[in-house]
Amino acid sequence: QFPRQCATVEALRSGMCCPDLSPVSGPGTDRCGSSSGRGRCEAVTADSRPHSPQYPHDGRDDREVWPLRFFNRTCHCNGNFSGHNCGTCRPGWRGAACDQRVLIVRRNLLDLSKEEKNHFVRALDMAKRTTHPLFVIATRRSEEILGPDGNTPQFENISIYNYFVWTHYYSVKKTFLGVGQESFGEVDFSHEGPAFLTWHRYHLLRLEKDMQEMLQEPSFSLPYWNFATGKNVCDICTDDLMGSRSNFDSTLISPNSVFSQWRVVCDSLEDYDTLGTLCNSTEDGPIRRNPAGNVARPMVQRLPEPQDVAQCLEVGLFDTPPFYSNSTNSFRNTVEGYSDPTGKYDPAVRSLHNLAHLFLNGTGGQTHLSPNDPIFVLLHTFTDAVFDEWLRRYNADISTFPLENAPIGHNRQYNMVPFWPPVTNTEMFVTAPDNLGYTYEIQWPSREFSVPE
């Protein structure tokens, strides 16, 4: 959401979020690292092109023209400098002048050594318990952001991992239309549209960066779960990894796993939608997970096949009209899982990414809650790996990513909600090894053609 330094009455009233980097001569003397040429405080650029007509409530949602409902001035960093005050480097760069390349490797969780697996699980648990050093979350909408007295900013601290959960919740929540009115649910700033892959890519990149800083370990990388096994078992659901099934309750995680101790955030949907409040940092019940356990829906009791990935990578158009969850021959809609793996839309189909979520049959299968199950991270790194392979094969052809008339939040130049500093979909539509400082250690299945007899 916003840097702690900007969650103040002064910043919110002025609309300026341009924190100092090294203010030697007092507050406001080094906004955006301007004294060392790193950046400067400028007007926010926000996409104002039209969105599709399925969202009819313009003017009612803080996420419109993000982030202008809150701030209209922010840091614009020069060269490879980056961050809320231009104090860090763009992904893939390091050094005092941000002029040295770095490349981290995201690997298959199952290929890690025992020590590496243990380190990853411990790191996730640390992220769940560690207050985010930079960001705070809003607990009220913009009209109530200064509190009942108009002088008390309504923000809370939140842990690094719960921030990851909260940003996802905020991007998918319904539009509140007022007390006594039903909230509008046909809106989603991170799913069912072209921004699905770019949004989740940045989401992971932010968590990875936060965990690198938390650990002081620049090489730290998020592993992936290759969920395209075609199996009806969760191969990473073991106590040394993401937690096996509890013997006492088949919908819970084994007490031998640290994840059995995790408590979820953003579970009070009824309050948010009827009272107009936002999810806060309060933790609730445990993670629920019952892999392959949805007997009422046999089609989600088995994971995608390896060939599904090979097939989806042959869909050459990134997206197609109406740029929604009913698009046909759209790579994005195919990997998201609303089309079958060949790209054909079918309302009954749930494949690839969607199928992996639904297979988990619990917290991880509910959109507003899903990141509470840390398997979400691994599921999405694999989805991002598929995206990156598509970008490599098709030379990051952005021509079918619409500039306008996509669902709200999904236009090419839209600032992804609710990330800070503002970052557009375009910035994430690039090959990761050359542009974002990470690569995947992965072998892709080749398409097998059956020869007719």
């Epitope: 860090t88 480097c89 390091r94 390349r101 490349l103 207050t131 690198q212 002081q216 370990e217 620049p218």
Partner: antibody, heavy 121, light 106 residues
């Protein structure tokens, strides 16, 4: 002036535990990560782990996991290293040292004078 | 990441130039520091980020390298340069040290 003042030498029995202290001055420990390093007699340097005094987070080299425990008291600007299940192999000088919170800077820039721990019957 | 440091020891005369090298088992992207330790004293930072001289360190010390290969060069040796030298990486946990180089001034 930045200083890291470590506690005095310790003579301990095998199997016992010892708690070493490192009192800092001249900087706010909440802005730094405090690391500990071991040096056995006539040997090189071995990294033990770090603590973030601001939140109590710790990371250890796997070979010290379970035997070393780092804690911090921000009110007194002091960090502690507790060693348990001591053997003669743990006879060494133990240094506390600091690293800038900006993890981009690869260095331990100030060091304590070291505490000698001797494990003997 | 393992750090291989060489030579284990060397001897040189005042005014000469010596080079100590550290090889990492993987790319550490310049996340490397060099320290000097005199007998019975604490280590002292010389170089960070592979090539940036720490405050107060004489300019006869210089760090270089990239990827997996790094070196510390000491030109116009002085008698006070005798001691042990260590490299340490900060790329991935644990942050291991090199085995050390003992420098003797003839």
């Amino acid at each position: 002036e930045v200083q890291l003042q470590q506690s005095g030498a310790e003579l301990v029995r095998p199997g016992a535990l010892v708690k070493l202290s490192c009192k800092t001055s001249g900087f706010n420990i909440k802005d730094y990560f405090l690391h500990w390093v071991r040096q056995r007699p006539d040997q090189g340097l071995e990294w033990i782990g770090w603590i973030n005094p601001d939140n109590g987070n710790t990371v250890y080299d796997p070979k010290f996991q379970g035997t070393a425990s780092l804690t911090a008291d921000t009110s007194s600007n002091t960090v502690y290293l507790q060693l348990s299940g001591l053997t003669s192999e743990d006879t060494a000088v133990y240094f506390c040292t600091r690293r800038d919170y900006t993890y981009e800077k690869a260095a331990l820039d100030y060091w304590g004078q070291g505490t000698t721990v001797t494990v003997s019957t | 990441i393992q750090m291989s440091q060489s030579p284990a020891s060397l001897s040189a005369s005042v005014g000469e130039t010596v080079t100590i090298t550290c090889r990492a088992s993987g790319n550490i992207y310049n996340y490397l520091a060099w320290y000097q330790q005199k007998q019975g004293k604490s280590p002292h930072l010389l170089v960070y980020d592979a090539k940036t001289l720490a405050d107060g360190v004489p300019s006869r010390f210089s760090g270089s390298g990239s990827g997996t290969q790094y070196s510390l060069k000491i030109s116009s040796l002085q008698t006070e340069d005798s001691g042990n030298y260590y490299c340490q990486h900060f790329w991935s946990l644990p942050f291991t040290f090199g085995s050390g180089t003992k420098l003797e001034i003839k």
